[in-house]
């Protein structure tokens, strides 16, 4: 069971300092941006991180949403990352959800975050290069110290 708490506005970056944004095709991508680029591309660069209480002690449960024309929420259904047109719900009556991730602070690096899927244990949000694009994907952690699954989260409010 997950119960919604508060939300905060955040900019999410990978460890190469590329900014996460949602493109015109609703795809989550990373791109090099100056601070002014980041501001100019808002609200596509501003993510709503909603925190949830969890009936089990598993970590800080969150959803990641973006509000362009409508609110879309990040999902990892079938291990495929996409934004679904939906508001983060007030309650989720299940112990797993495709839209709930556990935000984890890497021990020894308070400012580095990982987002583990509640549906697929051991699978994390990651940045992966595909041709010329840097995509947000769901990835099984396969090597120790994998930088692709680490992010920084900068609160904007």
């Amino acid at each position: 069971y997950f119960g919604k708490l508060e939300s905060k506005l955040s900019v999410i970056r990978n460890l190469n300092d590329q900014v996460l944004f949602i493109d015109q095709g609703n795809r989550p991508l990373f791109e090099d941006m100056t601070d002014s680029d980041c501001r100019d591309n808002a609200p596509r660069t501003i993510f709503i991180i909603s925190m949830y209480k969890d009936s089990q002690p598993r970590g800080m449960a969150v959803t990641i949403s973006v509000k362009c024309e409508k609110i879309s929420t990040l999902s990892c259904e079938n291990k495929i990352i996409s934004f679904k047109e939906m508001n983060p719900p007030d309650n989720i009556k299940d112990t797993k959800s495709d839209i709930i991730f556990f935000q984890r602070s890497v021990p020894g690096h308070d400012n580095k975050m990982q987002f583990e899927s509640s549906s697929y244990e051991g699978y994390f949000l990651a940045c992966e290069k595909e041709r010329d694009l840097f995509k947000l994907i769901l990835k099984k952690e396969d090597e120790l110290g994998d930088r692709s699954i680490m992010f920084t989260v900068q609160n904007e409010d």
């Epitope: 708490l5 925190m51 209480k53 002690p57 598993r58 800080m60 556990f102 984890r104 021990p107 308070d110």
Partner: antibody
């Protein structure tokens, strides 16, 4: 780097209560779990329970259920552990520990507070 | 009596490789991650290994963890005198809905 600073040593009578504090400085406090773990002289570690300050959710080990109360004050970044109906077997060093990665991964520990229960 | 079983003591000479075992059951290690802590004499425990085999920054790569079935182990290679300490394994136990520690292993560097 987060630092957890605990209150000083206490000597208590059997049947009384003790309240130990744990103040966090230099990092995020509210969204992570704070656990309390005790260690009797010459013995191993024993988890008592935890709190997620932001949600107020608490989880207690069955052994301590009804006797321990864990609270947190977000405004001062301080967590508290109160243990009641003290007996001599409760003589131990009590540690608070922060869990930022997972509620059960204690990545930062306080210095410990010795509680002695003696008549 | 601890839910997780560790040998009470272990020893080795400088430069040697030492392994400390931690045995549990399907209600804890078999279905959950294992963490390891080092407690130097007179100090608070310190996180050494988390999630079976991950090292926090600052922990030397001489320390490694592994898990197989309902058991886990901590390996220390190139043993040094400063490794003399108590080592504790920890996991989550579903049957007691509680986090559990092993009884601890006192490592002596001869």
């Amino acid at each position: 780097e987060v630092q957890l600073v605990q209150s000083g040593a206490e000597v208590k009578k059997p049947g009384s209560s003790v309240k130990v504090s744990c103040k966090a400085s230099g990092g995020t406090f509210n969204s992570y779990a704070i656990s309390w773990v005790r260690q009797a002289p010459g013995q191993g570690l024993e988890w008592m329970g935890n709190i997620i300050p932001m949600t107020g959710q608490t989880y207690y080990a069955q052994k301590f259920q009804g006797r321990v109360t864990i609270t947190a004050d977000e405004s001062t970044s301080t967590a508290y552990m109160e243990l009641s109906s003290l007996r001599s077997e409760d003589t131990a060093v009590y540690y608070c520990a922060r869990a930022a990665y997972h509620p059960l991964v204690f990545d930062n520990w306080g210095q410990g507070t010795l509680v002695t229960v003696s008549s | 009596q601890s839910v997780l079983t560790q040998p009470p003591s272990a020893s080795g000479t400088p430069g040697q490789r030492v392994t400390i075992s931690c045995s549990g059951s399907s209600s804890n290690i078999g279905n959950h991650y294992v963490n390891w802590y080092q407690q130097l004499p007179g100090t608070a425990p310190k996180l050494l290994i988390y999630r079976n085999n991950h090292r926090p920054s600052g922990v030397p790569d001489r320390f490694s963890g592994s898990k197989s079935g309902t058991s886990a182990s901590l390996a220390i290679s190139g043993l040094q005198s400063e490794d003399e300490a108590d080592y504790y394994c920890q996991s989550w136990d579903y049957s007691g809905f509680s986090t559990v520690f092993g009884g601890g292993t006192k490592l002596t560097v001869l």
